[in-house]
C-alpha cells in the first residue's frame, strides 16, 4: 500500500495473508468459513512451494493470540484466468479446515448485485504489500482509502487504454495506491467486498495508471458454484 497508514489492529477480521514457503505473497479475503478469495496470478510461480493462509493477523512477525496459519486443501483459479491478461484474475482457496471465527477472524459479505460502484465512492484497500519503491514491506497491515474512478476515464489511451472491461473497476492512484504484495486483497466499499486487487504488474502510485480491481459481483455465479 502506497501513501497509506497502519491499519487499526484486527479491525479487518476478513483480511488474509496468502503465504508461499512462509513468506507473505498476496492478500486475500475470507468470504466463507473455509474459503479465501484472492487473485489467480498469485499462484503462477508457486508450483513447487507450500501455499498457506494466515488469518487473524495484524503483524506478520509478532506473536498474536488470534493468528493462525492454515494449510490449503484446494486452490481453484478462475477457469478463464491466463498468465498474460488481467481478466478473470480470481482464485478461491479452500482451507484445510473451517477457520476458527472470532473478533479477529470473520468472513466479509461480498457484493452480489452486478452494478458499478458510483465514481467518487471512497473504498478501503488493505494489505501487507510494499509501501515504497525500494520494496519496504510492512510488518503490520496497512490500508488506504481510495476514490473509485469511472471506467471511461480509466480506459483512456493515457491510462489503461481500453483494458478495463465491465468485469473490472478502477480506483485513483495518485500517490495513494495498492502495490506489489497487495494483489488478491479486498477493496471494500460501505462494508461490502466490491473488488479484489488484480495482480498484473504495473507501476504504483502513478495517477495515470489507476489501480485495477476485479469486480466480485460479476463473478457471483462462479464463486457460488465453487463454494457450494
Amino acid at each position: 500500500i502506497l501513501g497509506g497508514r497502519e491499519a487499526e489492529a484486527h479491525a479487518r477480521p476478513y483480511m488474509a495473508s496468502v503465504q508461499l514457503n512462509g513468506a507473505h505473497l498476496c492478500g486475500g479475503v475470507l468470504v466463507a468459513e473455509q474459503w479465501v478469495l484472492s487473485a489467480a496470478h498469485c499462484l503462477e510461480d508457486a508450483a513447487d512451494g507450500k501455499v498457506q493462509v494466515l488469518l487473524g493477523a495484524h503483524s506478520l512477525s509478532q506473536p498474536e493470540p488470534s493468528k493462525r496459519l492454515y494449510d490449503v486443501l484446494r486452490a481453484v483459479p478462475h477457469p478463464d484466468s491466463q498468465p498474460d491478461t488481467i481478466d478473470h484474475d480470481l482464485l478461491l482457496l479452500q482451507l484445510s479446515e473451517k477457520a476458527t471465527l472470532g473478533p479477529a477472524v470473520r468472513p466479509l459479505p461480498w457484493q452480489r448485485v452486478d452494478r458499478d460502484v458510483a465514481p467518487g465512492t471512497l473504498c478501503d484497500v488493505a494489505g501487507w504489500g510494499i509501501v515504497n519503491h525500494a520494496g519496504r514491506r510492512p510488518d503490520s497491515l496497512q490500508h488506504v482509502l481510495l476514490p473509485v474512478l469511472d471506467r471511461a476515464t480509466c480506459n483512456r489511451a493515457t491510462h489503461h487504454d481500453g483494458a478495463i472491461t465491465e468485469r473490472l473497476m478502477c480506483a485513483e492512484s495518485n500517490r495513494r495506491d495498492s502495490c506489489k504484495g497487495d494483489s488478491g486483497g479486498p477493496l471494500v466499499c460501505g462494508g461490502v467486498l466490491e473488488g479484489v486487487v488484480t495482480s498484473g504488474s504495473r507501476v504504483c502510485g502513478n495517477a495515470k495508471k489507476p489501480g485495477i480491481y476485479t469486480r466480485v459481483a460479476s463473478y457471483a455465479a462462479w464463486i457460488d458454484s465453487v463454494l457450494a
Epitope: 514457503n21 513468506a23 525500494a134
Partner: antibody, heavy 118, light 107 residues
C-alpha cells in the same frame, strides 16, 4: 536457514569493472528484494540500491547511478552487482542483504572486499 | 538525504553492565529505525527493527525504543559476544542511510 554467500575478495585494476555475486539459499529467492551496501575501510555503511528478483525492478541511491548495476539470475538464486570505471574510491567491502520488514535488512552476506589497485 | 547521527563513536563497559546507544535522525523518520551489530570480522546482523521489534533469534537483553527523531538501543547484562560496533539505519526515506556507528569496547 537463510544464507547469503559472497566471495571473500576481489583485486581489480583502475578503470576496469567487477561483477560481485551473492548466492542466496534457505528461502524463496524471488519473494524478497535484495539490497547492496558499501563500507569503506574504517567507515560507516552506505546504501547502494535494491533489486526485486521477481521482475528485476531496481531502485538506486542517486550517488551510485552509473557506478553500480544490479541484476539477478533466478535460476541460480544469485544476485549480482557490477561496478564500473573503478577508482580507489571504490575500494571497500560490499555487502548484499535481504530485504526485511519495515525498511530493515534482515540477513547479510559476509561481504566482498574490493581492492582497486594498479 | 536524511542524516543519521550516533554521537558516541565508542563506549567502554564491563560484563554485566547495562548500556544505551543513541541515534538521532535529521528529520522525523516515523519509527522506521533499525539497529545492526557488526563484529570485527565484518559479520553484520539485524538486531531490532521499527524501532523495538526484536529480530528472530536475537536475545531479549537487546531492546529498542524511540520515536520521531530520537532512538536508542539498550543492551542489559552485557555478555562477551556483545562487544562489537552498532549501527542505526533509517528505512523511512530513500536513500536509506546509516549512522556512523558506536563501538562498544570492554572496560
Amino acid at each position: 536457514q537463510v544464507q547469503l554467500q559472497q566471495p571473500g575478495a576481489e583485486l581489480v585494476r583502475p578503470g576496469t569493472s567487477v561483477k560481485l555475486s551473492c548466492k542466496a539459499s534457505g528461502y524463496t529467492f524471488t519473494s524478497y528484494w535484495m539490497h547492496w551496501v558499501k563500507q569503506r575501510p574504517g567507515q560507516g555503511l552506505e546504501w547502494i540500491g535494491v533489486i526485486d528478483p521477481s521482475d528485476s525492478y531496481t531502485n538506486y541511491n542517486q550517488k551510485f547511478k552509473g557506478k553500480a548495476t544490479l541484476t539477478v539470475d533466478t535460476s541460480s538464486s544469485t544476485a549480482y552487482m557490477q561496478l564500473s570505471s573503478l577508482t580507489s574510491e571504490d575500494s571497500a567491502v560490499y555487502y548484499c542483504a535481504r530485504n526485511g520488514y519495515d525498511g530493515s535488512m534482515d540477513y547479510w552476506g559476509q561481504g566482498t572486499s574490493v581492492t582497486v589497485s594498479s | 538525504e536524511i542524516q543519521m547521527t550516533q554521537t558516541t563513536s565508542s563506549l567502554s563497559a564491563s560484563l554485566g553492565d547495562r548500556v544505551t546507544i543513541s541515534c538521532r535522525a535529521s528529520q522525523d523518520i516515523s519509527n522506521y529505525l533499525n539497529w545492526y551489530q557488526q563484529k570485527p570480522d565484518g559479520t553484520v546482523k539485524l538486531l531490532i527493527y521499527y524501532p523495538s521489534r526484536l529480530h528472530s533469534g536475537v536475545p531479549s537483553r537487546f531492546s529498542g525504543s524511540g520515536s520521531g527523531t530520537d532512538y536508542s538501543l539498550t543492551i542489559s547484562n552485557l555478555e562477551q559476544e556483545d562487544f562489537a560496533t552498532y549501527f542505526c539505519q533509517q528505512g523511512n526515506t530513500l536513500p536509506y542511510t546509516f549512522g556512523g556507528g558506536t563501538k562498544l569496547e570492554i572496560k
